[in-house]
């Protein structure tokens, strides 16, 4: 049929970037290149129906379903999803094609289903059908990698029992501290399962698949480092493998390393040693302590000793179940409008947590940093001075943890007014929560100094923005004030703001703001 328009259906996958998550715009986020969904005419259907290729979406992913229509003249449209009609606003692109978009933010089960788009053009009417389902990731897993010694070789194998099969990489660094951050030039990555070079300062193995990326660091005691004030602590669950590396450098080969658990030498088969000469002809020795599957009695102080270095220990604690230890009492903060401030949560957890910060139904990425004392810390600074309730949520395989924060921003009240035939109301969201006065303006009181106390009702209410309080004051209209100007003022320790209202007969009320 030559009257039929040329139609293109595309799927745009969005990368959620925190500044825009949760905003319903047509182009809410940084996007990937569009994927063509085909849109073929459906045979044997009553009317003209185009069917797009089925769309599979990850939970919480954000997408746009988009239709490009090459047809003359204007078009009108309507989206229908689960018997509800949704607004549709077509626009035209540079090639004068009609563009219709449906943005789905943070995909959930309830947003899966058939999306029907009805388009009416000057020439014809037609329907486009999209089927959106959630990708079945229930069978997907991503497990933290662990180490095994390679049979008959001085090498480590990195294993992650995950579905789909993960890509395994070793992340190596030979600097100290901050310069071993992931994107630092000092970091070398090797996409292989077996590692032979085990003398580096910092050795991690990472596994990644569709569910993300998990890493495990090779726990190391460096005898050339000054003994730390805090004894390093390593947690493991019963049945997991234990690996600790002891490393020491000396001017010559005349030294040896030994491991002891609670004053008893480790049994043969629970350790292996490697040594090499470094570029400056010093000798590097490493001694691994390992247990292929730990039991409760493997708990204790593991001490690495050398004849040429101070001994150092690590406390290994074997637990039956993972945990998250932190104080979950809610915390309230009050800051100035331009004050720098970050929420922070200090916790001890095993296995490592996954976490999010949430404000007003928007989720923000959560970073965690290990401290020297075995604790970790997560900070959130991106509050943009918006008052309200902030939630930190953390979980691992065995435990969950939630902590609430309230942020109040100290500022002078700002007043909004509204009126009906029977009453006038003023609203303010300043902080500290303001107090109210009402004043009548008359010939006797042109400066509006005559205070009104009768018929005033004050209340505070929780605003839609989570945890943000709004104060309101309502004046019930009496004959004594009808036809007069009244002034409502909200005041707190930072200032006062007023709004003047003309209480005339029913109809639109003029408001005069006078701060």
């Amino acid at each position: 049929n030559q009257d039929l328009p040329v139609i293109k259906c595309v799927l745009i996958n969005h990368k959620n970037n925190d500044s825009s998550v949760g905003k319903s715009s047509s182009y809410p986020m940084v996007s990937e290149s569009p994927e063509d969904l085909g849109c073929a005419l459906r045979p044997q259907s009553s009317g003209t129906v185009y069917e797009a290729a089925a769309v599979e979406v990850d939970v919480s992913a954000s997408i746009t379903l988009q239709v490009l229509v090459d047809a003359p003249g204007n078009i009108s449209c309507l989206w229908v999803f689960k018997h509800s009609s949704l607004n549709c606003q077509p626009h035209f692109d540079l090639q004068n094609r009609g563009v219709v978009s449906m943005v789905i933010l943070k995909m959930t089960e309830t947003q899966a289903g058939e999306y029907l788009l009805f388009i009416q053009s000057e020439a014809t009417n037609y329907t486009i059908l999209f089927t959106v389902s959630i990708r079945n990731t229930l069978l997907y897993t991503l497990r933290r990698p662990y180490f095994r010694k390679m049979e008959n070789q001085d090498a480590l194998v990195c294993i992650s029992e995950s579905v789909p099969e993960p890509i395994v990489e070793w992340v190596l660094c030979d600097s100290q501290g901050e310069s071993c951050k992931e994107e630092s030039p000092a970091v070398v990555k090797k996409e292989e399962k077996v590692l032979h070079e085990l003398f580096g300062t910092d050795i991690r193995c990472c596994a990644r698949n569709e569910l993300g990326r998990e890493c495990t660091r090779l726990f190391t005691i460096d005898l050339n480092q000054t003994p730390q004030t805090t004894l390093p602590q390593l947690f493991l669950k019963v049945g997991e493998p234990l690996w600790i590396r002891c490393k020491a450098v000396h001017v010559n080969h005349g030294f040896g390393l030994t491991w002891e658990l609670e004053n008893k030498a480790l049994e043969e088969g629970n350790y292996f040693e490697m040594s090499t000469y470094s570029t400056n002809r010093t000798m590097i020795r490493i001694l691994f302590a390992f247990v292929s599957s730990v039991a409760r009695n493997d708990t204790g102080y593991y001490t690495c000793s050398s004849s040429k270095h101070p001994s150092q220990s690590a406390l290994v604690t074997i637990v039956e179940k993972g945990f998250i230890n932190a104080t979950n009492s809610s915390e309230d903060y009050e800051i100035d409008q331009y004050e720098e401030f970050c929420f922070s949560v200090r916790f001890k957890a095993y296995p490592q947590i996954r976490c999010t910060w949430t404000f007003s139904r928007k989720s923000f990425p959560c970073e965690q940093k290990g401290l020297d004392n075995g604790y970790s810390i997560s900070k959130f600074c991106n509050h943009k001075h918006q008052p309200g309730e902030y939630i930190f949520h953390a979980e691992n395989d065995d435990a969950q943890f939630t902590k609430m924060f309230t942020l109040n921003i100290r500022r002078k009240p700002q007043v909004l007014a509204e009126a009906s035939a029977s009453q006038a109301s003023c609203f303010s969201d300043g902080y500290p929560l303001p107090s109210w006065t009402w004043k009548k303006c008359s010939d006797k009181s042109p400066n509006c100094t005559e205070e009104i106390t009768e018929g005033v009702w004050n209340r505070k209410a929780n605003r839609k923005v989570f945890g943000q309080w709004v104060s309101s004051s309502t004046l019930n209209m009496s004959e004594a004030i009808k036809g007069f100007l009244v002034k409502c003022c909200a005041y707190n320790s930072l200032g006062t703001s007023c709004e003047t209202i003309l209480l005339n007969s029913p109809g639109p009320f003029p408001f005069i703001q006078d701060n």
Epitope: L231, N263, Y301, T303, S305, P310, S311, S313
Partner: nanobody, 111 residues
Framework: QVQLQESGGGLVQPGGSLRLSCAAS????????IDWYRQAPGNEREWVAQ???????FYADSVKGRFAISRDNAKNTVYLQMNSLKPEDTAVYYC?????WGQGTQVTVSS
């Protein structure tokens, strides 16, 4: 319950000497190495010396040649002999066995 108790601190003139003791109870002293640390006002705690189970001793560069660590397993006590003291040695001195710390003893070097 493991308890460590330091003693022997005090006020001494630059160039003078002091001998600190660390007595342990509730713990078989002979099975572990012992560290001495110190903390000057406004500074982090820093490692000073260690004596291993076998009696080998190690020192921080700042005290090498001036301090000597020793142990008496029969008395469950470790000692830190401090000679040629300098004002910068002023600090609270702590002994440590594994995760266990003493309360500390104050050493002040001043004329």
């Amino acid at each position: 319950q493991v308890q460590l108790q330091e003693s022997g601190g005090g006020l001494v003139q630059p160039g003078g000497s002091l001998r600190l003791s660390c007595a342990a109870s509730g713990f078989d002293f002979s099975i572990s190495y012992i560290d001495w640390y110190r903390q000057a006002p406004g500074n982090e705690r820093e490692w000073v010396a260690q004596i291993t189970r076998g009696g080998d001793s190690f020192y921080a560069d700042s005290v090498k040649g001036r301090f000597a660590i020793s142990r008496d397993n029969a008395k469950n006590t470790v000692y830190l002999q401090m000679n040629s003291l300098k004002p910068e040695d002023t600090a609270v001195y702590y002994c440590r066995i594994l995760s266990y710390w003493g309360q500390g003893t104050q050493v002040t070097v001043s004329s």
